[in-house]
Interface confidence: low
């Protein structure tokens, strides 16, 4: 249970950054993920754009408490969730959103964490246990990362929608215009 950044002892730990870092897992009902930002049908993407500078993704602030076993931070921390399609800004959205927005063999751009910051938090524990101090790694900015079809699925999984947008407690319900009907096809849909 709990976030990968923690061990259940008194040590302070900041995990090493991997090339494709995983955002923190959901923390026992206390992570705010902007479910509404989960939405948005992938726009039609009729051609490949080479210039990554044209791509942008959303940096969504959210507040949550850090937990480590039964202990919880005295104050919530604020970090970013990386969200949104990485599409060229000049393209119009597809009204129905049922088509892939990249060429079948073209590049795939994902909105992923770019920079991190470390923050020390004090954890309060039940039963009169001594407070613990932790350093946690928080997402500080996001970027669009260009992938190719040659990236294997384990790499893709690291910043797939379920990782970037924890869905705990969400009941599946139909989306406007049936945009979820072909979610398997739209790998990068939320």
């Amino acid at each position: 249970q709990g976030w990968q950044a923690f061990k259940n002892d008194a040590t302070e730990i900041i995990p090493g950054l991997r090339e494709y870092p995983e955002p923190p897992q959901e923390l026992e009902n206390n992570q705010t993920m902007n479910r509404a930002e989960n939405g948005g049908r992938p726009p039609h993407h009729p051609y490949d754009t080479k210039d990554v500078s044209e791509y942008s993704c959303r940096e969504l602030h959210y507040t949550r408490f850090v937990t480590d076993g039964p202990c919880r931070s005295a104050k919530p921390v604020t970090e970013l969730v990386c969200s949104g399609q990485c599409g060229p800004a000049r393209l119009l959205p597809n009204a129905i959103g049922r088509v892939k927005w990249w060429r079948p063999n073209g590049p795939d751009f994902r909105c992923i964490p770019d920079r991190y910051r470390a923050q020390r938090v004090q954890l309060l524990c039940p039963g009169g246990a001594a407070p613990r101090s932790r350093k946690v790694r928080l997402v500080a900015s996001c970027k669009c990362k260009r992938l190719t079809r040659f990236h294997n699925q384990s790499e893709l999984k690291d910043f797939g929608p379920e990782t970037a947008r924890p869905q705990k407690g969400r009941k599946p319900r139909p989306r406007a215009r049936g945009a979820k009907a072909n979610q398997a096809e739209l790998e990068n849909a939320y």
Partner: antibody
Framework: QVQLVQSGAEVKKPGSSVKVSCKAS????????LNWVRQAPGQGLEWMGT????????TYSQKFKGRVTITADKSTSTAYMELSSLRSEDTAVYYC???????????WGQGTTVTVSS | DIQMTQSPSSLSASVGDRVTITCSAS??????LNWYQQKPGKAPKLLIY???SLHSGVPSRFSGSGSGTDFTLTISSLQPEDFATYYC?????????FGGGTKVEIK
Amino acid sequence: QVQLVQSGAEVKKPGSSVKVSCKASGYTFTDYFLNWVRQAPGQGLEWMGTIYPYHDGTTYSQKFKGRVTITADKSTSTAYMELSSLRSEDTAVYYCAREEEDGQFDYWGQGTTVTVSS
Amino acid sequence: DIQMTQSPSSLSASVGDRVTITCSASQGIQWYLNWYQQKPGKAPKLLIYYTSSLHSGVPSRFSGSGSGTDFTLTISSLQPEDFATYYCQQHSKLPRTFGGGTKVEIK
């Protein structure tokens, strides 16, 4: 049908606090973000913050951070917005609004007029 | 914060006119733009979301277009009930921000 019903008008003194309620019905309260937006007389709309009642996660506009607190009572499907250290420029109509999955505010409360006057 | 600028701030038009309102974002917001209609003393009503998707129950004379930083709300044939103030709103980044509004008045 979806309804958001807000509490009645308030008149407050500068420096005091106000707590506005927003009772939701017609949908699963915990499944949607609930936002607060205000509108000063003759002015435009200003977003204040949001809550996700499922686990009480909140996000606030930097402008109001420290002065605004948004809470939710799941048992009554009611959200609350408390604004402290009131000043005359906080005189406005305060709206709650449900946020749909594509980021749109699809249902709004009728508004609560808060007047701050000495 | 992303600034949303609407133009014109007000316009006079007649029933049957084609009306165009523009909304400009201070930075690219892709398609994350909504339009609302507000009448005096009433709460805003959602018209269009995600740049061009019509909210349920909204007449088809309303349409939206644009991407990046420039967006347009068009009323193809203005009806008496359309005289109101219209707001754009971005949800690309927090905080959510609204345009200053465009008041559509009877000529």
